[in-house]
């Protein structure tokens, strides 16, 4: 997260760290007791490493009573996701067992009504992604409150040049933005999961390259079918 602040510890009990060989790779969001939603491209970066999910964490390194690392029983990328595009960039990870819920571990309600979030709405994005252009990684969870940007502006030739589909949404990126390592993390608007950080190699913090998020409401049928 660029230009953000350290999050209040455990105030985002849905927040997950998707890890490979014990290292943070991507963000994720607990959407059901045994399921974490993330970005499909995160798996590509995992290669053949052991994928696990850390829940209940604020610090990645320090011991915390609520922290627990879960093995992944099944990884289900969206069937239409492709390495060369950010379309359908969603991934569902089934934990090896149901998460132990508590104040620091709790699923987040996700949006099922397939309607765009109003531009100007302030939404929270959080993650353990890089906090500087130099690539500095934080130990503790960071967050930033960003306004949603209308799709027409996001699709301008000077911005994302028509790449933003109806199944995506954008948020402002003027010095404050999600970045590398935040992919798969949640964009939360008024207590409801609306978007998942896409995992392209987009430049971060540039006003003309807004953050791109996959709209979860557009994938309600797929999410429901996997979770069923």
């Amino acid at each position: 997260i660029l230009g953000g602040r350290e999050a209040e510890a455990h105030a985002r009990p849905y927040m997950a760290s998707v890890q490979v060989n014990g290292e943070h790779l991507c963000g994720g969001v607990l959407v059901a007791e045994q399921w974490v939603l993330s970005a499909a491209h995160c798996l590509e970066d995992a290669a053949d490493g052991k994928v696990q999910v850390l829940l209940g964490a604020h610090s990645l390194s320090q011991p915390e009573p609520s922290k627990r690392l879960y093995d992944v029983l099944r990884a289900v990328p969206h069937p239409d996701s492709r390495p060369d595009t950010i379309d359908h960039d969603l991934l569902l990870l089934q934990l090896s067992e149901k998460a132990t819920l508590g104040p620091a571990v709790r699923p987040l309600p996700w949006q099922r009504v397939d309607r765009d979030v109003e531009p100007g709405t302030l939404c929270d994005v959080a993650g353990w992604g890089i906090v500087s252009h130099a690539g500095r990684r934080p130990d503790r969870l960071q967050h930033v409150l960003l306004p949603v940007l209308d799709r027409a502006t996001c699709n301008r030739r000077t911005h994302h040049d028509g790449a933003i589909t109806q199944r995506m949404m954008c948020a402002e990126s003027n010095r404050r933005d999600s970045c590398k390592g935040d992919s798969g993390g949640p964009l939360v608007c008024g207590g409801v999961l609306e978007g998942v950080v896409t995992s392209g190699s987009r430049v971060c913090g540039n006003r003309k390259k807004p953050g791109i998020y996959t709209r979860v409401a557009s994938y309600a049928a797929w999410i429901d079918s996997v979770l069923a």
């Epitope: 105030a11 109003e118 302030l122 929270d124 402002e172 010095r175 008024g190 207590g191 409801v192």
Partner: antibody, heavy 122, light 107 residues
């Protein structure tokens, strides 16, 4: 403690412009959105728009686009609202208010300025 | 825009009574609602955020409830300092519109 101090009352002529200020203290100015709200005499509250001092990002209620322009001066922790082409309909008390954040993504206007009265009269 | 319909517009009550003010949103606002109190000639003050949470320093006789499109503010055992106008405001999308207000007067 948090305090938002607004500039004094204004009496302006129709067609003119007026710039009112809101000086923030007691918190990190660049970290919080500042809103502006209009209240006509004896009436309810209308949201005009917000500005984020950390990036100068703004968002306006469609109704106030072209009427209000929001700016900030980070060096003095002051937010400004310029109201242009004034008519009697713009006679009102204008408040600045800070967005406070709660939990992961809830917010509300937690601190308000005392209000600035703008009277448009020839 | 989401419309916020507040009722009653005015009410006259005695000290010690309990009052309830309601606010109806034109669509689901997912508990993204605040309540404010405004005294004559003063700025509004935040009472409740996220539909049910009391802001710092607000007496416990105030309580917020509701979900979806229906919300209410309850004031138990009304005190003389509670008289004034009350407004709800949603934060689900833009613009974050206010209700028309409820004026609470002493009987």
């Amino acid at each position: 403690q948090v305090h938002l101090q607004q500039s004094g009352p204004e009496l302006v002529k129709p067609g003119a412009s007026v710039k009112i200020s809101c000086k923030a203290s007691g918190y990190t100015f660049i970290d919080y959105y500042i809103n502006w709200v209009k209240q006509r005499p004896g009436q309810g509250l209308e949201w005009i728009g917000w500005i984020f001092p950390g990036s100068d990002s703004t968002y306006y209620n469609e109704k106030f686009k072209g009427k209000a322009t929001l700016t900030v001066d980070k060096s003095s922790s002051t937010a400004y609202m310029l109201l242009s082409s004034l008519t009697s309909e713009d006679s009102a008390v204008y408040f600045c208010a800070r967005y406070g954040y709660y939990g992961s993504s809830f917010y509300a206007m937690d601190y308000w300025g005392q209000g600035t009265s703008v009277t448009v009269s020839s | 825009d989401i419309q916020m319909t507040q009722s009653p517009a005015s009410l006259s009550v005695s000290v010690g009574e309990t009052v309830t003010i309601t606010c109806r949103a034109s669509e689901n606002i997912y508990s993204n609602l605040a309540w404010y109190q405004q005294k004559q000639g003063k700025s509004p003050q935040l009472l409740v955020y996220a539909a049910t949470n009391l802001a710092d320093g607000v007496p416990s006789r105030f309580s917020g409830s509701g979900s979806g499109t229906q919300y209410s503010l309850k004031i138990n055992s009304l005190q003389s300092e509670d008289f004034g106008s009350y407004y709800c405001q949603h934060f689900w999308g833009t613009p974050p519109t206010f209700g028309g207000g409820s004026k609470l007067e002493i009987k």
